[in-house]
Interface confidence: low
Amino acid sequence: GQNITARIGEPLMLSCKGAPKKPTQKLEWKLNTGRTEAWKVLSPQGDPWDSVARILPNGSLLLPAIGIVDEGTFRCRATNRLGKEVKSNYRVRVYQIPGKPEIVNPASELTANVPNKVGTCVSEGSYPAGTLSWHLDGKPLIPDGKGTVVKEETRRHPETGLFTLRSELTVTPAQGGTTPTYSCSFSLGLPRRRPLNTAPIQPRVREPLPPEGIQLLVEPEGGTVAPGGTVTLTCAISAQPPPQIHWIKDGTPLPLAPSPVLLLPEVGHEDEGIYSCVATHPSHGPQESPPVNIRVTETGDEGQAAGSVDGSGLGTLAL
């Protein structure tokens, strides 16, 4: 049999070898596709089948607009003028090229020596599903589950049957390397079909804090507290000599004397926000801790609030 690949929505014509120039009863097509239950028989004398397929005068079978449900096996049996039976057998597969893939939520900056999300590559409208692959500086990036992690997701549209692919890349860049260039490509895996490439992204690699990096500890854990409760933030840093520690809320310095501990007693909603501490060390200037989101909630439900918090003041602050 012959393998045929056809693009969804386009016409497909299958020729019937040995078909007589003026067909009589001596030609028939048998189809086993997603539209048929087992085999469907079509003959030149029969009606066109649901506008899906019809036999042309030369015996060829025409499908005016092929779809996913037309994938399957097509067989023609014809008797030539000499009375010899000639069979044609086709295995038909369909494809659809998706739109150009793109990297959504691309990182503009990566921190060396820690896992960072580079971005999510998205391809929409393919058939068959195909594959997404990542490239670093033009070379294929092989996920190893450690320094390079790829999370993939494939969804199929319930009506069109076309696929959406998502591939999230997380990397742990080395320190002191060059600026990496990441790109992603989609491949249908069909012969003579070139991969589709995204525009490249070039996040800069930020050096991590020195070994004596800052840790921000929060009590209660998770940073969610009931109104009237107490929150204790502790800025832990192993540097010697100990640096001055200042406190930041929503990007603004809190006017307090430097201290490694920030105590928020009897908290109210005005105390909610994103807190971090800044250590000023003679050898490498100010270093900021990762942020902690403090939430004041009646029910004590856990969870992170997203986005910026515009501070409009603090309640009582004690050190």
């Epitope: 900056e109 930020r206 200042h246 930041i248 929503d250 990007g251 603004t252 310095p253 809190l254 006017p255 307090l256 004397a257 994103i274 800044v278 200037g285 100010p286 900021e288 942020p291 910026s308 918090v309 515009d310 501070g311 409009s312 003041g313 603090l314 602050l317």
Partner: antibody, heavy 117, light 109 residues
């Protein structure tokens, strides 16, 4: 050399909006907070708000909440301030300044905004 | 909102020591107000001099120093020079906002 380069003067109509940019160079943009300040003609300075480029978190003077919106584009090391629903009261020189939490060492040259019909 | 008050103008001579002060309407200025001092020269040229009461900004000459004198923040210029003629603004952090003073016009004759 550390520099904050601000956009040139803007002449805008009442009710319109304007977006001022402040492009940082010569230092790591995400390591410092960006402060925005207003200087009205013949008056002192007024603090508008801060943005932390590393996290994108903002903090506003309540007087300017709703009037000013602060954003950053880390890829181009640029801070932006959009002023909405402009009136003649908003005619002023607007400055960005780099802050490392306890001093504002480097300032932009200022952007003059004139609101006039 | 707090009001921050400065001397409107001061005059000094080259080589002299001059002190500019900054008062808060809410009471004594403390280290918790993180007093800042900013210099404005003609054509809107601003430079940060002092932050956190007494931290000199990088590159600022040693003749500029910040301190607390009594209940006020102070900027002292030891051995003033003609190029120090400018307007000096102080700024104080309060719990949720930053307030600038009206500025002191310093003349060096």
């Amino acid at each position: 050399e550390i520099q904050l380069q601000q956009t040139g003067p803007e002449l805008v109509k009442p009710g319109a909006s304007v977006k001022i940019s402040c492009k940082a160079s010569g230092y790591s943009f995400t390591d410092y907070i960006m402060l925005w300040v207003k200087q009205s003609h013949g008056k002192s300075l007024e603090w508008i708000g801060n943005i932390n480029p590393y996290y994108g978190s903002t903090f506003y003077n309540l007087k300017f909440k709703g009037k000013a919106t602060l954003t950053v584009d880390k890829s181009s090391s640029t801070a932006y301030m959009q002023l909405n629903s402009l009136t003649s009261e908003d005619s002023a020189v607007y400055y960005c300044a780099r802050s490392d939490y306890w001093y504002f060492d480097v300032w932009g040259a200022g952007t003059t905004v004139t609101v006039s019909s | 909102q707090a009001v921050v008050t400065q001397e409107s103008a001061l005059t000094t001579s080259p080589g002299e020591t001059v002190t500019l002060t900054c008062r808060s309407s809410t009471g004594a200025v403390t280290t918790s107000n993180y007093a800042n001092w900013v210099q404005e020269k003609p054509d809107h040229l601003f430079t940060g001099l002092i932050g956190g009461t007494n931290n000199r900004s990088p590159g600022v000459p040693a003749r500029f120093s910040g301190s607390l004198i009594g209940d006020k923040a102070a900027l002292t210029i030891t051995g003033a020079q003609t190029e120090d003629e400018a307007i000096y603004f102080c700024a104080l952090w309060y719990s949720n906002h930053l307030v600038f003073g009206g500025g002191t016009k310093l003349t060096v004759l």
